[in-house]
């Protein structure tokens, strides 16, 4: 209805004497702001005097004058949206209808909201899931239909009258919607606790209790079981009996069947609450339970474990590991079935008593060749002794002994002879298969073991061979001694230890590495020509005409080896320089001429420098000097001077004639 | 301080020939450890040596090999300068062209490196 | 005669090093120690950094240095400057007829 005010606020409120009430609360007036307000308690309207009457709570008019005794009642809203209250303290004569009267401008309005106000603080409500089970958590709900900020409490829980060690939490709601205080309590309840009492329980801000809410809890939960068995440690001998109860401690709801296992498996046609077991075998050994269901599930006993005991069944015997490498270790275990376990072992070693081995297991911590061959074992316990089994084979395996490498050739070996070596050994477990050689080489091996080596190295030092079953052995190197040429010949420079430059004194020395035998002679050759036969060859004073290319020789009685040619290099300033005129040194004006510097250097010269007439330089730093178009004045003497790393030389004079052309004389 | 100002016209005509001149201050066009260039710069050629003068007991001078024969370098000793002529120009000579000093001598060392350069002038050859 | 080769661009950020490098052939660059850089700003005229490979004309800072291996000169900017930006050119002496050969240009950026 658009004619109406529209209000929003809680329907009821609940406080009790001496603690407060907050009424959260909006509106819409239909025009303008707010000019007055009254809070009265329990209006009814005179038709008379066309008014309401009533206790008068609270008055604001357009002054704004409040009166001072009604500082209890406190109107926290505004003029035009905001229509908040508060009672603080509330009476239980406050209980009853609130009247809003609100009037604007033109309108007016009485919206009314129910108080209840209770001589005591009333219990919370405790809230439960519709069913509960063990060890599924649940959340319990407390909650008052009170909160107001001026009056602080607080919801405890407790079990049994002592309080929950689980963290709750508080939630309060003062809104227009609604006015509570909550607490939420997650909890995971075990069987034990179905029947007990849990309580919810208000207090005040220091913890003064205010009233509570209880309830007891109905936890349901599978059948809780006893077992119980004669004879009570469950040890019997093959032929014994055996009785074993079953007792129901605890179901919710009642239980419904009954059923016995062995080992997780359930047993044939035992539904009743005692197992009898009559004449019992070693079969029967193993672990035993009830099981009882009620509509939650099954529950299940604790396991007993029943022990049938009877003497050691026949043996074997396990090794760990065969075939075992010589050097490993091996553990031999004696397994025979017995109740109770055997507590001595006598052991045998191809059908021979093994003496002062009496456990379970026997440790061999180096494995020989001579510990190969058939394990067997006998077990003995308090009820007798078992029989020997039929044993286990130990294969024990080794590298091939006492490998030599021999070589078959008459000596001394030279290079470049066939060499023949064969590759021995005394045992093997498992047999060679193959046969290695170091170092490795293009070898021939005509056939197993043996080792040919065609147009033998001056370097092939020493040979050694392994046989190779799962694992090589190395024999011991041999040394071939093979003897050569001198090697590695060749020209190493002295003196000087820099460049060679004309006028040094130059030493050459012939070098090489290696020779065998180690007697040997020199001799040097320049293009062909012998020189000396001394290690070194030298110059007092080299010149450039030393230079060239020299070679030195070495041999022994094996033969002779040349060193690469060496080039001497003689080093020297630029000599013999002269400029040389192109198309030649008289050149018609207009023309081209190019003067070269020509030079004689080691190095070559690296900068040349051009000269006039006048010694004045001329801009240029090419050997070749380009003047284009040549004119009458460029006539006259022009000089080079050539430079490299070791000096500077300079050209004689070399003249340059330019003449009139023929239309210049014409024009004269 | 060493200066080269240019001068010269900005439009040729093709065939027509191109001429430049450069006026030294601070150095002279005689002086026996320099020589005077003439360098160009396009965006299709990048920067471009043209050719020198220089005296030493005579007047030498040097040209680059893809303008010799139609170019020349002359020099007036008493107004210290020197030009540029280039004949029957093409639109292919069009670019800003620069007079430049190459000072020979460092000390008692030889030296190469054009230390000074004029201010330049753009030269568009067009019709 | 055929330019020099220079990289068409370099950059880097203030305050770092960049080399530019300039291959030519044992006819110039390799052949005389007369290698020179120029530094070109828009609408200027080149100016003279480096001459002689290595040598500076006083007035040029010492952030600039020149060198050569075989047939490629090079030259280092260290300590970037935004006032470095520009296009810059080697130059060396050559033994063919057309004495002087130039760089075909690098365009430094600083970033």
């Known amino acids: 209805d658009s004619s109406k005010w529209v209000f929003e606020h809680p329907e009821t409120l609940y406080a009790w004497e001496g603690a407060c009430v907050w009424i959260p609360c909006t509106y819409r007036a239909l025009d303008g702001d707010l000019e007055s307000f009254i809070l009265f308690h329990n209006p009814e309207y005179n038709k008379n005097t066309s008014k309401f009457d009533g206790t008068r709570l609270y008055e604001s008019t357009k002054d704004g004058k409040v009166p001072s005794e009604q500082k209890r009642v406190q109107f926290l809203g505004d003029k035009n949206k905001n229509c908040t209250l508060s009672i603080h303290p509330v009476h239980l004569n406050d209980s009853g209808q609130l009247g809003l009267r609100m009037e604007s401008k033109t309108e007016k309005w009485m919206e009314r909201i129910h108080l209840n106000v209770s001589e005591r603080p009333f219990p919370p409500h405790i809230q439960l899931p519709p069913e509960i089970q063990e060890s599924q958590e649940v959340t319990l709900t407390c909650l008052l239909n009170f909160s107001c900020y001026g009056y602080p409490i607080q919801l405890q829980w407790l079990l049994e009258g002592v309080p929950m060690r689980q963290a709750a939490v508080t939630s309060t709601s003062l809104t227009i919607k609604s006015v509570f205080t909550r607490s939420e309590l997650k909890f995971s309840p075990q069987w034990s606790h179905h029947g007990k009492i849990v309580t919810c329980q208000l207090q005040d801000a220091d913890g003064k209790f205010l009233s509570n809410d209880t309830v007891q809890l109905n936890v349901k939960h599978t059948p809780k079981l006893e077992i119980k068995v004669t004879p009570s440690d469950a040890i019997v001998r093959e032929g014994d009996s055996v009785t074993m109860t079953c007792e129901v401690s605890s179901s919710n709801p009642e239980y419904t069947t009954v059923s016995w296992l062995k080992d997780g498996t359930s047993l044939k046609k035992q539904n009743t609450f005692t197992l009898n077991l009559r004449e019992v075998t070693k079969d029967q050994s193993g672990k035993y339970c009830c099981q009882v269901s009620n509509d939650v599930g099954p529950g299940r006993s604790e396991e007993v474990f029943l022990q049938v005991q009877y003497a050691p069944e026949p043996s074997t015997v396990q090794i760990l590991h065969s075939p075992a490498v010589e050097g490993s270790q091996v553990e031999f275990l004696c397994m025979s079935l017995a109740n109770p376990l055997p507590t001595n072992y006598t052991w045998y070693h191809n059908g021979k008593e093994m003496q002062g081995r009496t456990e379970e297991k026997v440790h061999i911590p180096k494995i020989l060749p001579w510990h190969a061959g058939t394990y067997s074992c006998v077990a003995e316990n308090i009820l007798g002794t078992g029989q020997r089994g039929p044993g286990a084979e130990l294969d024990v395996q080794y590298p091939p002994k006492k490998v030599t490498t021999v070589i078959q050739n008459p000596m001394p070996i030279r290079e470049g002879d066939t060499v023949t070596l064969s590759c021995n050994y005394n045992s093997s477990n498992p047999s060679v298969t193959r046969y290695e050689w170091k170092p490795h080489g293009a070898w021939e091996e005509p056939s197993l073991g043996v080792l040919k080596i065609q147009n033998v190295g001056w370097d092939n030092t020493t040979i050694a061979c392994a046989a190779c079953n799962s694992w090589c052995s190395w024999a011991s190197p041999v040394a071939l001694n093979v003897q050569y040429a001198p090697r590695d010949v060749r020209v190493r420079k002295i003196k000087p230890l820099s460049e060679i430059h004309s006028g040094n004194s130059v030493s050459l020395q012939c070098d090489f590495s290696s020779s065998h035998p180690k007697e040997v002679q020199f001799f040097w050759e320049k293009n062909g020509r012998l020189l000396g036969k001394e290690s070194q060859l030298n110059f007092d004073s080299i010149s450039p005409e030393d230079a060239g290319s020299y070679s030195c020789w070495v041999n022994n009685s094996i033969g002779q080896t040349a060193s690469k040619a060496w080039t001497l290099e003689v080093l020297y300033a630029p000599r013999r320089l002269r400029v040389s005129m192109s198309p030649g040194d008289q050149v018609m004006e207009g023309k081209s001429a190019t003067l070269t510097c020509e030079s004689d250097a080691n190095p070559p010269v690296s900068h040349y420098t051009w000269f006039d007439w006048n010694n004045q330089s001329l801009p240029y730093h090419s050997q070749k000097l380009r003047l284009e178009p040549v004119k009458v004045q460029h006539s006259g003497a022009y000089w080079c001077q050539g430079t490299n790393s070791v000096g500077k030389g300079r050209s004689p004079l070399s003249t340059l004639t330019v003449y009139y052309s023929p239309e210049t004389i014409g024009r004269r | 301080e060493v200066q080269l100002q240019q001068s010269g016209p900005g439009l040729v005509k093709p065939s027509q020939t191109l001429s430049l001149t450069c006026a030294i201050s601070?150095?002279?066009?005689?002086?026996?450890?320099?020589?005077w260039n003439w360098i160009r710069q396009s965006p299709s050629r990048g920067l471009e040596w043209l050719g020198r003068t220089y005296h030493r007991s005579t007047w030498y001078d040097d040209y680059a090999s893809s303008v010799r024969g139609r170019v020349s370098i002359n020099v007036d000793t008493s107004k210290n300068q020197y030009s540029l002529q280039l004949n029957a120009v093409t639109p292919e000579d069009t670019g800003v062209y620069y007079c430049?000093?190459?000072?020979?001598?460092?000390?008692?060392?030889?030296?190469?490196?054009?230390?000074?350069w004029g201010q330049g002038t753009m030269v568009t050859v067009s019709s | 005669q055929s330019a020099l080769t220079q990289p068409a661009s370099a950059s880097g950020s203030p305050g770092q090093s960049v080399t530019i490098s300039c291959t030519g052939t044992s006819s110039d660059v390799g052949g005389y120690n007369y290698v020179s850089w120029y530094q070109q700003h828009p609408g200027k005229a080149p100016k003279l950094m480096i001459y002689?490979?290595?040598n500076r004309p006083s007035g040029v800072s010492n952030r600039f240095s020149g060198s050569k291996s075989g047939n490629t000169a090079s030259l280092t900017i260290s300590g970037l400057q935004a006032e470095d930006e520009a296009d810059y050119y080697c130059s060396s002496y050559t033994s063919s007829s057309t004495l002087y050969v130039f760089g075909t240009g690098t365009q430094l950026t600083v970033l």
């Open positions: 002689d490979v290595s």
């Open positions: 430049a000093r190459d000072r020979l001598q460092d000390g008692n060392s030889w030296s190469d490196a054009f230390d000074v």
């Open positions: 601070g150095d002279s066009v005689l002086s026996n450890s320099d020589t």
